[in-house]
Interface confidence: low
C-alpha cells in the first residue's frame, strides 16, 4: 500500500507542474527560492519564479524538450546560481555554486539562516493594506509568501499555502467591512501567532531529522500517531509513519514540490482509509485539500479502545521478549512504543520516547545476561521516576504561573535561564524565556490528563529554538551539551542546569540602562520586552542577585517609566530620573 511509489517520469518538473497546478507550483517555487536566498529582493525572486514556470510549461508541452529531464535540484540550483549579486550578498554561500548536485543543494541547506538580519515586519495602516490588496491581489499574496518564507527558512511549505489562503480570505472579507480594522486586525494577529507556532514546530521536525536522523523522527511519529489514532493497528500506524517521514524529509531538504505533492497523497490515503485509522477524521475529510491536510495534522485524539490488555504480558512476562527483540529490534521497539503511546494520551511524546529508550537499554543488557527474564522483570518500575519528574515540574510551574500571571512568570524564567546560561545573547534569552513562559497560559488551563502532552511537547519546540539560534553562534558549552546529547532529554537537561558558577559577571554599562521617551509610544508587548531585556542585563551584571533585589529594581524601573511617560517634558525626565534609577539600582545590587 505504498502511497508514494510512482512511475518514473521523463520530466520531473512537468510531472510536479501537472500534479500541483500552476498557482501552487509558482507559490512553492517562490517559497523555496526565498528560503534559500533570504536576502534577495522580492522582484528578483518573482523574476526567477516566472522563468522557472515558463520553462516548466515547455516541459509539460514536450517532456523530451531540452533540459526537461534534469532533476529539480539541478534546475532550481542552476537558477539560483544566476543571481548576479550572490557573492556580495551571501559571501561564502556563493561557493555552493561551484559544486555539483547533490552537494550543491546540501551546501545551500547548510547556509539557511534561522535568524536572518532582516528588518522587523511593520504592519501598515489597514487602508494602505486594503488598497494594495485591491490594486494587485496576486503581488500582495506573493509578497506575503516571500516575507514569511525568508524569515522562516524551514516553514512547512504546504502549510504556508494554507496560511496564504486564510490571509487572502481575511482581506477579501474585511476590506469590504464597515470597520475594516476591527475585522482585519484580530485575524492578522491570529495568523501571525499561529504562523510563529507552526514555524517553530516544523523547525523541531527538521532538527530531529537533520541532527538526530530518520530513526529519531520515526520514533516521534510512532508515538504521536499512536496517541492520535489508538484504534489503528500497528501496521497502519507504521505505514503512516513511513509516508509522513518521507513528506517531512522532503520539505526539510528543500524539495518543496515533492513534499506538497506527497502530503496531498497522504491526506487522500488517510481519508480513503479513515475507517481503519480514526473516527475523528470525517469532518476533516470533507474539506478542500489545504484545509483537509491542516485539519488532519491537528485532529484530536480518537478514543482509546476499551479493554486493552496489560502491556506487561507481551513486553515483560512473555518468554519470547528477547527472541522478538533480537529478530527485529526496531520493529519490536516500535510495537512497544505504539502500545504504550495508544494507552497514554496523557503523556508527552518525549516522555514516551524516554520510556522506550529505557526499555531498549534494559533489553540490550538483559538479553545478553545469564537469566534475561529475571534481569528485565522489574523494567516497568524504572518508568515511575521518569513519569513523575515532568508531572512534578509541570505542577510546580503551573502553581507559579497561577500565582504570578504570564508576565511575571516569564520574568521568573528569564532570571532562571539567564543564571543557567548567562553567555547566551540577551535577545535570544528574552525571546526564548518569553516563549517558555507562554506554556502557562497555553497549558495550565487544561485538566491533568492534557497538561503534560501540552506542556512538555511545547517546551521541546521552544528549547529547539534556543538550540538552533545558539548553533549559529555557539557561546555556551552547557547549551551545546543539552542540545546535542539527546533530543528527548533536552528539557530535563536544561531543567537540571544550576547557576553557572564559572560565569564572570558582565561589566556594568550605564548605556544599557538608559531609556528614552520613545518607550512611551511602544505597545504593551514591546514595553514588556524592553523591561525584560533590562532584567536579563541586570542578572548578567549581578548573577548572584536575589529574587527580592531584582524585584525591587524592576518595580522601581516600572515606576520610573510610568512617571516619565506622564511627565510634560518626557525626555528630560528620562535623562534625570534615569541617572538616579541607575545609581539606586547599583546600590541595591551592590554593583
Amino acid at each position: 500500500r505504498g502511497v508514494f511509489r510512482r512511475d518514473a517520469h521523463k520530466s520531473e518538473v512537468a510531472h510536479r507542474f501537472k500534479d500541483l497546478g500552476e498557482e501552487n507550483f509558482k507559490a512553492l517555487v517562490l517559497i523555496a527560492f526565498a528560503q534559500y536566498l533570504q536576502q534577495c529582493p522580492f522582484e528578483d525572486h518573482v523574476k526567477l519564479v516566472n522563468e522557472v514556470t515558463e520553462f516548466a510549461k515547455t516541459c509539460v508541452a514536450d517532456e523530451s524538450a531540452e533540459n526537461c529531464d534534469k532533476s529539480l535540484h539541478t534546475l532550481f540550483g542552476d537558477k539560483l546560481c544566476t543571481v548576479a549579486t550572490l557573492r556580495e550578498t551571501y559571501g561564502e554561500m556563493a561557493d555552493c555554486c561551484a559544486k555539483q548536485e547533490p552537494e550543491r543543494n546540501e551546501c545551500f541547506l547548510q547556509h539557511k539562516d534561522d535568524n536572518p538580519n532582516l528588518p522587523r515586519l511593520v504592519r501598515p495602516e489597514v487602508d494602505v493594506m486594503c488598497t494594495a490588496f485591491h490594486d494587485n491581489e496576486e503581488t500582495f499574496l506573493k509578497k506575503y509568501l516571500y516575507e514569511i518564507a525568508r524569515r522562516h527558512p524551514y516553514f512547512y511549505a504546504p502549510e504556508l499555502l494554507f496560511f496564504a489562503k486564510r490571509y487572502k480570505a481575511a482581506f477579501t472579507e474585511c476590506c469590504q467591512a464597515a470597520d475594516k480594522a476591527a475585522c482585519l486586525l484580530p485575524k492578522l494577529d491570529e495568523l501571525r501567532d499561529e504562523g510563529k507556532a507552526s514555524s517553530a514546530k516544523q523547525r523541531l521536525k527538521c532538527a530531529s531529522l537533520q541532527k538526530f536522523g530518520e530513526r529519531a523522527f520515526k520514533a516521534w511519529a510512532v508515538a504521536r500517531l499512536s496517541q492520535r489514532f489508538p484504534k489503528a493497528e500497528f501496521a497502519e500506524v507504521s505505514k503512516l509513519v513511513t509516508d509522513l517521514t518521507k513528506v517531512h524529509t522532503e520539505c526539510c531538504h528543500g524539495d518543496l514540490l515533492e513534499c506538497a505533492d506527497d502530503r496531498a497523497d497522504l491526506a487522500k490515503y488517510i481519508c480513503e482509509n479513515q475507517d481503519s485509522i480514526s473516527s475523528k477524521l470525517k469532518e476533516c475529510c470533507e474539506k478542500p485539500l489545504l484545509e483537509k491536510s491542516h485539519c488532519i495534522a491537528e485532529v484530536e485524539n480518537d478514543e482509546m479502545p476499551a479493554d486493552l490488555p496489560s502491556l506487561a504480558a507481551d513486553f515483560v512476562e512473555s518468554k519470547d521478549v528477547c527472541k522478538n527483540y533480537a529478530e527485529a529490534k526496531d520493529v519490536f521497539l516500535g510495537m512497544f512504543l505504539y502500545e504504550y503511546a495508544r494507552r497514554h494520551p496523557d503523556y508527552s511524546v518525549v516522555l514516551l520516547l524516554r520510556l522506550a529508550k529505557t526499555y531498549e537499554t534494559t533489553l540490550e543488557k538483559c538479553c545478553a545476561a545469564a537469566d534475561p527474564h529475571e534481569c528485565y522483570a522489574k523494567v516497568f518500575d524504572e518508568f515511575k521516576p521518569l513519569v513523575e519528574e515532568p508531572q512534578n515540574l509541570i505542577k510546580q510551574n503551573c502553581e507559579l504561573f497561577e500565582q504570578l500571571g504570564e508576565y511575571k512568570f516569564q520574568n521568573a524564567l528569564l532570571v532562571r535561564y539567564t543564571k543557567k546560561v548567562p553567555q547566551v545573547s540577551t535577545p535570544t534569552l528574552v525571546e526564548v524565556s518569553r516563549n517558555l513562559g507562554k506554556v502557562g497560559s497555553k497549558c495550565c488551563k487544561h485538566p491533568e490528563a492534557k497538561r503534560m502532552p501540552c506542556a512538555e511537547d511545547y517546551l521541546s519546540v521552544v528549547l529547539n529554538q534556543l538550540c538552533v539560534l545558539h548553533e549559529k553562534t555557539p557561546v555556551s558549552d552547557r547549551v551545546t551539551k543539552c542540545c546535542t546529547e539527546s533530543l528527548v532529554n533536552r528539557r530535563p537537561c536544561f531543567s537540571a542546569l544550576e547557576v553557572d558558577e564559572t560565569y564572570v559577571p558582565k561589566e556594568f554599562n550605564a548605556e544599557t540602562f538608559t531609556f528614552h521617551a520613545d518607550i512611551c509610544t511602544l505597545s504593551e508587548k514591546e514595553r514588556q520586552i524592553k523591561k525584560q531585556t533590562a532584567l536579563v542585563e541586570l542578572v548578567k551584571h549581578k548573577p548572584k542577585a536575589t529574587k527580592e533585589q531584582l524585584k525591587a529594581v524592576m518595580d522601581d524601573f516600572a515606576a520610573f517609566v510610568e512617571k516619565c511617560c506622564k511627565a510634560d517634558d518626557k525626555e528630560t525626565c528620562f535623562a534625570e530620573e534615569g541617572k538616579k534609577l541607575v545609581a539606586a539600582s547599583q546600590a541595591a545590587l551592590g554593583l
Epitope: 537499554t361 543488557k365 538483559c366 522489574k378 546529547e485 530535563p492 537537561c493
Partner: nanobody
Framework: EVQLLESGGGLVQPGGSLRLSCAAS????????VAWFRQAPGKGREFVAG????????YYADSVKGRFTISRDNSKNTLYLQMNSLRPEDTAVYYC???????????????????WGQGTLVTVSS
Amino acid sequence: EVQLLESGGGLVQPGGSLRLSCAASGRYIDETAVAWFRQAPGKGREFVAGIGGGVDITYYADSVKGRFTISRDNSKNTLYLQMNSLRPEDTAVYYCGTRPGRPLITSKVADLYPYWGQGTLVTVSS
C-alpha cells in the same frame, strides 16, 4: 571493559561523616548512569543514590535523603558519596555500579547494573 574501584570506607561513630569515592576506568563517568548501592549482612543489595548519564539528575533512597549527597568529578572520572549524620543502620558494604547506554536516570534495580566495584565497608558504631 569498565573497571570500578571504591575507597573511603571505615569505622565511624554515629552522627559522624565519611566520603566514599569510586574511580572508573574504561568509560567516562559522565556518559553513563551510576549509582551507589549497599548490602548489609544477610540482606540484598539496596539502592542508596544515583546520578543520570549526560545530565546531573540525582535520585536518593528515602532513608538517606538530606544526609547523603552523590556527585561526580568528570575531570577525575570519579563518583563520590558524601555521607553525613551516619546511623548504625547505615552499616554495610557500599558498592558503585554503572549502566551502559547513557540512560537519563539511574535504576534502583541492582540487576540492571552490569559493572560493579568490589565494595568498601562502612561501619557505624560507638
